[in-house]
Interface confidence: low
């Protein structure tokens, strides 16, 4: 069992003859007469298990002590330190022949943990180790003790484990602590990444490359990396992490924005306070909520304040000529705080006698410069049907009209288009022949441009070629043309007037009489 | 779902090329490296080596040095194998399988998708 | 390379019968070690990773123990779909060897 005893953050402990609860029970050849297991006691009445041996009346002494099997952990060099007290030859009398001050360290790597003898020529020498002039002075109880303390390291190492061996060849000493271990560079964090704990390389100038992981709420900006010393040291830290969209880093930790901030992008910079017209009630908001009745539109920055509709434009002149008009109005009182103000013409036809049932223009109506996006004040519309009831709104719009949900921002005007010629009449009908008379139909203009005052039907003899022709006017969208000429091709055109003129004819009707008395019923443009 | 998507059988003869892909999906292809792994008829798995998504660099394991590349098109998160001058030794099913190309703090690998194989048959 | 050994070739359990596969490393491979089920026809199944840790959606009558070069895969009851070939491969230094696989069947 061992206690704990507290190290460099770097570096991890294998073997701790310090910590060890009682003996620690080495193997020693030779078995008696050598090295020599002793309790003393520190200052603060603790034992220390100490391996001693002071052979130095007794020529060639070969006294060798091995440490129990030590796992390496996957570490590839470690390091050996040893305090010791070692006796000056000069101290002890009648000596000088038989007397060291140095003793040496082995190591043995094994896959085998239970290896029962010290086989000598299995050890490979780490070092001859000499007492130095830096020693500390230990006191316990009613001695100082003269501790020197040395250092070595041994790699690369391949095996699960290894074997320490200290050979003795005829010195004073006492070995008070040995202590085995290897170096990492502890787990640390370095710009928002975090490095886990990284065994240092197998040999004493190489550098482990490690990826670091960005901290609990951030993300990589440019690939972290830091290099893992051969000292346990972190060096040449590269690349970073960000803190995500809400959270701001705070004491090397990306902390969620505190209510009324918030932050959009992973980035460095600090939370934000929310913009004008907007306010966040949680933690870590990456946008803040617009007020009510405020909006922020699909491409506005988080950064922008919220922004409302337009109110409607104003002062809406309308000015008619025939069937155009032309409109114009001032900017709205109010743009809802945005500069994209734009304006949609919407034009509905209304019927004369119940203005409520309005219908949309349709196509055929004509905007310049176009009917929606305007971002001028002015459009003229043509293409208006004659004598019609048009009611035009103008709706001030802009990035964040669409979620509005009750638009109040338009304003809107009611003309009646002046009477026009009518259209041509697109269908006449032979409804029917006899010999001396055809019955005729058609129907109203498409756009009559005004009241139908009457219809003008000409006719005249194919062959005759419009030199003779004769004309019939009709009140109805039908007649009967009488006192023709039988087995005779008469042609036949329509057309309808208004107070503001007549229309144009309409295509021929071409339609041939009988010669005997019975009536051919047809309803062709083109009946024979 | 995260899956990996193999190229059909093939049969070739021997000298002839062939080439092997595996379409990724469900994920961010470039987080994870891609490994391919042999399995000869009625034999164990054999590890072939890997290539890095972020930068394109192939590892090939000793025995499949020479006659084998590792390639990747980012662009449609393929990667793919293509064995030259074949041999009737190399007739097996061959696996790509994905690893995290980071440890991202778990200091343990392992293959927790493989595609669903394609058998390569080199036959005169 | 680290050489993978997998014992037995193959184990004949009843079903409901616990089943204990071992794997040999060559070195300690510091529980660096996935434990892979292939059926018939199929590609592999990572069951094991890191020596004791449970995949995703895996049930728990699989577990896996060891250190050092000495690992186990322990199926506590075998049902009829845990006959199969089971396979473990370590991750401790390229190249990454699988075991050559136990079979298990049914006795």
């Known amino acids: 069992v061992t206690g704990s005893r507290v190290y460099p953050a770097n570096e991890v402990t294998l073997l701790d003859s310090r910590s060890v609860q009682g003996e620690l029970g080495w193997i020693a050849s030779p078995l008696e007469g050598g090295w020599e297991e002793v309790s003393i006691m520190d200052e603060k009445n603790t034992p220390i298990r100490t391996y001693q041996v002071c052979n130095v009346m007794e020529p060639s002494q070969n006294n060798w002590l091995r440490t129990d099997w030590i796992t390496r952990e996957g570490a590839q060099r470690v390091y050996i330190e040893i305090k010791f007290t070692l006796r000056d030859c000069n101290s002890l009398p009648g000596v000088m022949g038989t007397c060291k001050e140095t003793f040496n360290l082995y190591y043995y790597e094994s896959d085998n943990d239970k290896e029962r003898f010290i086989r000598e020529n299995q050890f490979v020498k780490i070092d001859t180790i000499a007492a130095d002039e830096s020693f500390t002075q230990v006191d316990i109880g009613d001695r100082i003790m003269k501790l020197n303390t040395e250092i070595r390291d041994v790699g690369p190492l391949s095996k699960k484990g290894f074997y320490l061996a200290f050979q003795d060849v005829g010195a004073c000493i006492a070995l008070v602590s040995v202590r085995v271990f290897y170096k990492k560079c502890p787990l640390t964090v370095r710009n928002l990444a975090q490095f886990p704990d990284t065994i240092t390389g197998a040999d004493t100038s190489s550098l482990v490359e490690v990826r670091g992981s960005c901290v609990n709420n951030s993300e990589e900006k440019d690939v972290p990396k830091m290099y893992c010393g051969a000292d346990g040291e972190w060096l040449v830290p590269i690349g970073n992490c960000l803190c995500n969209a809400g959270h701001e880093e705070r004491s090397g930790e990306c902390q969620a924005c505190k209510i009324g901030y918030y932050k959009a992008l992973s980035t460095d910079a600090t939370c934000a306070k929310c913009p004008p017209h907007s306010y966040s009630v949680w933690e870590g908001a990456t946008s803040c909520t617009c007020d009510r009745g405020f909006f922020r539109a699909d491409n506005d920055a988080a950064s922008m304040p919220c922004t409302r509709p337009p109110s409607a434009p104003l002062n809406l002149i309308s000015n008619v000529n025939e069937t155009s008009v032309n409109l114009e109005w001032s900017s709205p009182q109010n743009t809802g705080g945005r500069q994209d103000i734009s304006y949609n013409v919407v034009c509905k036809k209304c019927g004369a006698g119940d203005p409520s049932k309005c219908r949309p223009c349709g196509s055929g109506v004509h905007y310049t410069p176009q009917q929606n996006g305007l971002k001028t004040t002015k459009v003229s519309i043509t293409d208006l049907l004659a004598h019609t009831n048009y009611t035009f709104e103008i709706w001030a719009v802009n990035g964040v009209s669409k979620y509005n949900p009750n638009p109040d921002q338009s304003v809107s005007v009611t003309v009646t288009t002046n009477q026009a010629a009518p259209s041509s009449i697109a269908l006449v009908q032979a409804k029917e022949v006899t010999r001396y008379s055809v019955a005729l139909a058609w129907l109203e203009p498409d756009r009559p441009n005004g009241v139908i005052l009457e219809y003008e039907v000409k006719y005249y003899e194919k062959d005759q070629n419009e030199r003779s022709y004769r004309i019939v006017r009709t009140a109805a969208r039908n007649t009967d043309i009488k006192g023709l000429n039988p087995l005779t091709s008469y042609v036949f055109h329509v057309r309808a007037r208004t107070a503001a003129g007549y229309g144009d004819f309409s295509e021929p009707l071409e339609v041939t009489t009988n010669t005997v008395p019975s009536r051919i019923i047809g309803d062709g443009a083109n009946s024979t | 779902q995260v899956q990996l998507v193999q190229s059909g059988s093939e049969l070739k003869k021997p000298g002839a090329s062939v080439k092997v892909s595996c379409k990724a999906s469900?994920?961010?292809?470039?987080?994870?490296?891609m490994h391919w792994v042999r399995q000869a008829p009625g034999q164990g798995l054999k590890w072939m080596g890997w290539i890095n998504t972020e930068t394109g660099e192939p590892t090939y394991a000793d025995d499949f040095k020479g006659r084998f590349v590792f390639s990747l098109d980012t662009s449609v998160s393929t990667a793919y194998l293509q064995i030259s001058s074949l041999k009737a030794e190399d007739t097996a099913v061959y696996y790509c399988?994905?690893?995290?190309?980071?440890?991202?703090?778990?200091?343990?690998?392992?293959?927790?998708?493989w595609g669903q194989g394609t058998t390569v048959t080199v036959s005169s | 390379e680290i050489v993978m050994t997998q014992s037995p070739a193959t184990l004949s359990v009843s079903p409901g019968e616990r089943a204990t596969l071992s794997c040999r490393a060559s070195?300690?491979?510091?529980?660096?070690l996935a434990w892979y089920q292939q059926k018939p026809g199929q590609s592999p199944r990572l069951l094991i990773y890191a020596a004791t840790n449970l995949a995703d959606g895996i049930p728990a009558r699989f577990s896996g123990s060891g250190s050092g070069t000495e690992y186990t895969l322990t199926i506590s009851s075998l049902q009829s779909e845990d006959f199969a070939v089971y396979y473990c491969q370590h991750f401790w230094g390229t190249p990454w060897t699988f075991g050559q696989g136990t079979k298990v069947e049914i006795k």
């Open positions: 399988a994905r690893i995290p190309l980071y440890y991202y703090g778990s200091r343990y690998w392992y293959f927790d998708v």
């Open positions: 469900g994920y961010t292809f470039t987080d994870y490296s």
């Open positions: 070195e300690n491979i510091y529980r660096n």
